[in-house]
Structure formats: C-alpha cells, structure tokens
Amino acid sequence: KKVVLGKKGDTVELTCNASQKKNTQFHWKNSNQIKILGIQGLFLTKGPSKLSDRADSRKSLWDQGCFSMIIKNLKIEDSDTYICEVENKKEEVELLVFGLTANSDTHLLEGQSLTLTLESPPGSSPSVKCRSPGGKNIQGGRTISVPQLERQDSGTWTCTVSQDQKTVEFKIDIVVLAFQKASSTVYKKEGEQVEFSFPLAFTLEKLTGSGELWWQAERASSSKSWITFDLKNKEVSVKRVTQDPKLQMGKKLPLHLTLPQALPQYAGSGNLTLALEAKTGKLHQEVNLVVMRATQFQENLTCEVWGPTSPKLTLSLKLENKGATVSKQAKAVWVLNPEAGMWQCLLSDSGQVLLESNIKVVPTW
C-alpha cells in the first residue's frame, strides 16, 4: 500500500495509472467503499462522500491512462485509505494529513516560550524535527517546545514530520519581539551631548504601547524614572519626563533619546522597557553611560571616569609627543606637577581607545 503525506489546508494528488494509455472507466472510493469520484462516459461524476466538493481529477491526463484524484483544502479527517478501481484492479493509497501550528501568537517576546503542536490522524505515530533560522535543531512528538526564545530565533522555522519513511515539510514564520541589542554602552566626555538609540529587531505594521527608561546613577542611592513615553502606530510622544536631566525624545522609530549634557551625576545604567499593546510582558534593553572628566587643579592633573566600567579597562594620562604616561586599571589617574603641553586622557580596552579627552597644561612661572 502506498503512503502519501499531506498538509492541512494544502492540496494533494493521489495518482492512479492504468496499464494502457487510454481513457477508461475508473472510480475512487474511500475505505467505507463510498464513491468519491469517477468517470461516466466522458464526464467526471461525484459520489455522496464528504469530499465531493473538494475532490477533482485531471481530465487532460485521462487519455494518457492517468486517473489521479486531487483533494483541495485538506483536513486531518481526510486521512484514510483511498481505493482507485481501474481495469479490474484496485490500487490502495493511504493518505495521512498532518497540521503543525504554533499554539499561541507567532509574534512572541524574547524569553517567552514557543510551543508547536502537531495535529495528526488517529493511529499515526509521527516524529517531528524542527530547525530554527539560527540552525538550532529540536525534536519531539506531538508537541515541540522552545522554552526561551532568543532574538536569533526570529524567521522561518522549518519542521519536518516523518511517518512510514515519508516526510512532509512545514514552514512557520516566528517573529521574536526584542531590541536589536540586549545592552549598549555610550562613552562621553563631560559636557558632550549623549545620544541613546534603541533599535528594534522586528518590524510590525502597527506598533502601539508604552515605554519607560529607569535610571540608576552611580552616585545616587536609588533608581528613578527618567522618561515615560507613548507609542502609537510607530509615532512616539512623551508622557512624562523628569526635570533633571531633561531628556528629549525623537518622534519616530527607532526609539531615540538625547541627554543634553553628559555629567558625572548622570553616569550609570538604565533599563528601557517597552510594553506592547495586546502582548504580555515587556521588551528590555540595558544602556550604560560612562562619563570622563579631565581637570587641572593647582599642581594636580586628574582624569576620572564615572559609570559602569569593567575592571580590565585602562585609564591613562599621556603627554602628547612625549613618552610620559601614567596608566591604571582604575577609575581615576593623576599626575602631580605635570609638564606643560597637551595631555590626553584615554580610556581603553585591550589597546582600543573607547574615550579620550584632551587638556592643555600651561606652564606655571
């Protein structure tokens, strides 16, 4: 018996060939011997089966001895053994129809779980193997669960259902709602304007919700809300902003915030959350601000950084065009009685300069 696998909602063609390449009598029946379709004279006739309005045949191939049955808009309950009667012989074809669906919205927040459920005919014992856009392989039976979706899981998932050495492939588009980056750090000299950007890793026709940036300044004992905003059809409007600092926000996506001045008291880390309408949970992006200040006071030249820096970062004071350098894996470096000239304060990570500030030391007479 030939086995054919079909997909729910798709069209399947069950083939039946006569030995002689000519038009002849044929019938398709189901396992209960109820006629589905056949030929009477030169015309296609349909029986009283439930398939009658969805079953058809390729009339153009009849004179070549091909008497296939096409079933449109397949349903799980169409799974059955179908019998083709032609030239006093019977050909049996077992049709197994499967459906694979995400049993929740296919637009999911990062960290949420995705469950794919296989609909299958009674008596079947299929296996399912799914491959994520990032190449992750997951296997299962009637259900496949991906517990913690990551942003790289966005895209088309390809799932293969196997039964009796036959396979059928499903493609499911999953959109993981997340920011492009989980975390970002902005390095600025004191007084410079700061730009924070929060690009999304997805696009939606309508994007509505609300967001907030909570900020924990390094020098403050507690965090506070810097800005609360509204998002309506990709248009951004500020609902509430703290007085100090007075952030500005772009009116269009990507979400864009401007801090007029980088000051030591603002250095720290923030958490931008975005709650989307009709979605449970929130999108998060962490943002850090590191501020550098170089100062000369009497005989002391000091360079300091504030904000979340890793212990492996190096802070250096260096006299331009001279070898004089002081370097530390610390948040402050200083030189007593510095030589006159242009000094550079550098914050670097394994030789890569993240932030630099110049300060001119004038000779003292």
């Epitope: 809300s225 509430r240 703290t242």
Partner: antibody, heavy 119, light 107 residues
Framework: EVQLVESGGGLVQPGGSLRLSCAAS????????MSWVRQAPGKGLEWVAN????????NYVDSVKGRFTISRDNAKNSLCLQLNSLRAEDTAVYHC????????????WGQGTLVTVSS | DIQMTQSPSSVSASVGDRVNITCRAS??????LAWYQQKPGKTPKLLIC???SLQSGVPSRFSGSGSGTDFTLTISSLQPEDFATYYC?????????FGQGTTVEIK
C-alpha cells in the same frame, strides 16, 4: 513593604482649612510621582492632584484648583495636601497613592483620612 | 475632561460565573487605562494597568482588554473574594478620571 499612612483629617467648618500628610516608607519616595484621590461617603473615587518626583510639576482637578496645594518633602518621605476654602462637597476620605510603572497607574494606596466639612 | 462610563453599575452573579465589566472613554485613551478593586471599608487595589497588563500577585482569572475608547475587565470564574466594587481609570490626560464603579454582588 510599601506603606502609605495619611493623617490630618477631621471636622472643619465651611471656608476653613486643613493640612493632610502622608508618610511613605518601604520604597525610594523621591523616585515616584504621588497622587491624592478622594472618595465621598458611599460614592466613587475622584482623583484630586499629583506631584512629580522633585515637586516642580503639579496637576489638579478643576474643582480644587486655587484652593488645594500639593507638596512634598523628599528628605522626610512626606507628601502633603493643604486644603483651603473648604466646602461641604469636599467631605471625603482622602487617600495618598503612589504612581508606579510606565502605565502611570496607582499601584499602592494609603488607608485614607476622613475630612468632614460641616457647620 | 475625559468622561469614563462603566456598565453595568451593578451585577449579581454566582461563584463560578464569568463576569464582564465594560468601561467607555469619551475620547481615545489608547491603552492608558487601569482597573481597581475595592472592598467595603478597604483601600482600592490595582488589578490591571495598560488596559491588559495584570499586576503581579493578581489571580489570572482577571483579564483586561480593549484599546482606544472601549475596554473590558473579565473575571473568568468568580470566586467568593471577588465580590467588590470595580473602577476603571484613565491616565491619558489630566485630570485623571475614574468610572463611577461597578458593584459585583452575590446572586
């Protein structure tokens, strides 16, 4: 544990004044907007006023504008509502409430203090 | 000012019933809507903010839906402790306004 405790309510004659206080604990008071909401006996809730984290921004319902003043003292974790030119229709239980999170909802409420305006 | 109209003003229901309370805003408020529960002699308790975000610790039988001007609070299977008055409140623009309340009573 977040706690809000109101005080200062009482019986006052029409045209009189009262000062309501709300003592906050269990959270960083200076990081939150705060509101006053009142409820007349047997009636529904009515939002009265709110104030931002540092006290520089205040909003009021029209019926109390020019008569009520909201203020805060972050050093003392205290919220106040000064009630002047009181009317009979100001009789209510006055609750202070914290505004929490990005949807600006009132996530913690005090038990309230009763203000009765009657001659 | 934005008017908030709740319906019904009271509803009689039995334990296990599904209860829907609707709230209509006189102008669009997007999702800036909260639902509160108040029991006699008690302080109001926040159930839902952002029209549909359940507050932590609130049972999952409570759910909120809607956007713009029409909102619904649903209690999927009423429990004895759910008999109370429910208020909606808009935080879209000042002055913030509450609905007049819906009392859920025992049938």
């Amino acid at each position: 544990e977040v706690q809000l405790v109101e005080s200062g309510g009482g019986l006052v004659q029409p045209g009189g004044s009262l000062r309501l206080s709300c003592a906050a604990s269990g959270f960083t008071f200076s990081s939150y907007w705060m509101s006053w909401v009142r409820q007349a006996p047997g009636k529904g809730l009515e939002w009265v006023a709110n104030i931002n984290e540092d006290g520089s921004e205040k909003n009021y319902v029209d019926s109390v504008k020019g008569r009520f003043t909201i203020s805060r003292d972050n050093a003392k974790n205290s919220l106040c509502l000064q009630l002047n030119s009181l009317r009979a229709e100001d009789t209510a239980v006055y609750h202070c409430a914290r505004e929490g999170g990005q949807w600006l909802a009132l996530d913690y409420w005090g038990q309230g203090t009763l203000v009765t305006v009657s001659s | 000012d934005i008017q908030m109209t709740q319906s019904p003003s009271s509803v009689s229901a039995s334990v296990g019933d599904r209860v829907n309370i609707t709230c209509r805003a006189s102008q669009g408020i997007r999702s800036w809507l909260a639902w509160y529960q108040q029991k006699p002699g008690k302080t109001p308790k926040l159930l839902i903010c952002g029209a549909s975000s359940l507050q932590s610790g609130v049972p999952s039988r409570f759910s909120g839906s809607g956007s713009g001007t029409d909102f619904t609070l649903t209690i999927s299977s009423l429990q004895p402790e759910d008999f109370a008055t429910y208020y909606c409140q808009q935080a879209n623009s000042f002055p913030w306004t509450f609905g007049q309340g819906t009392t859920v009573e025992i049938k």
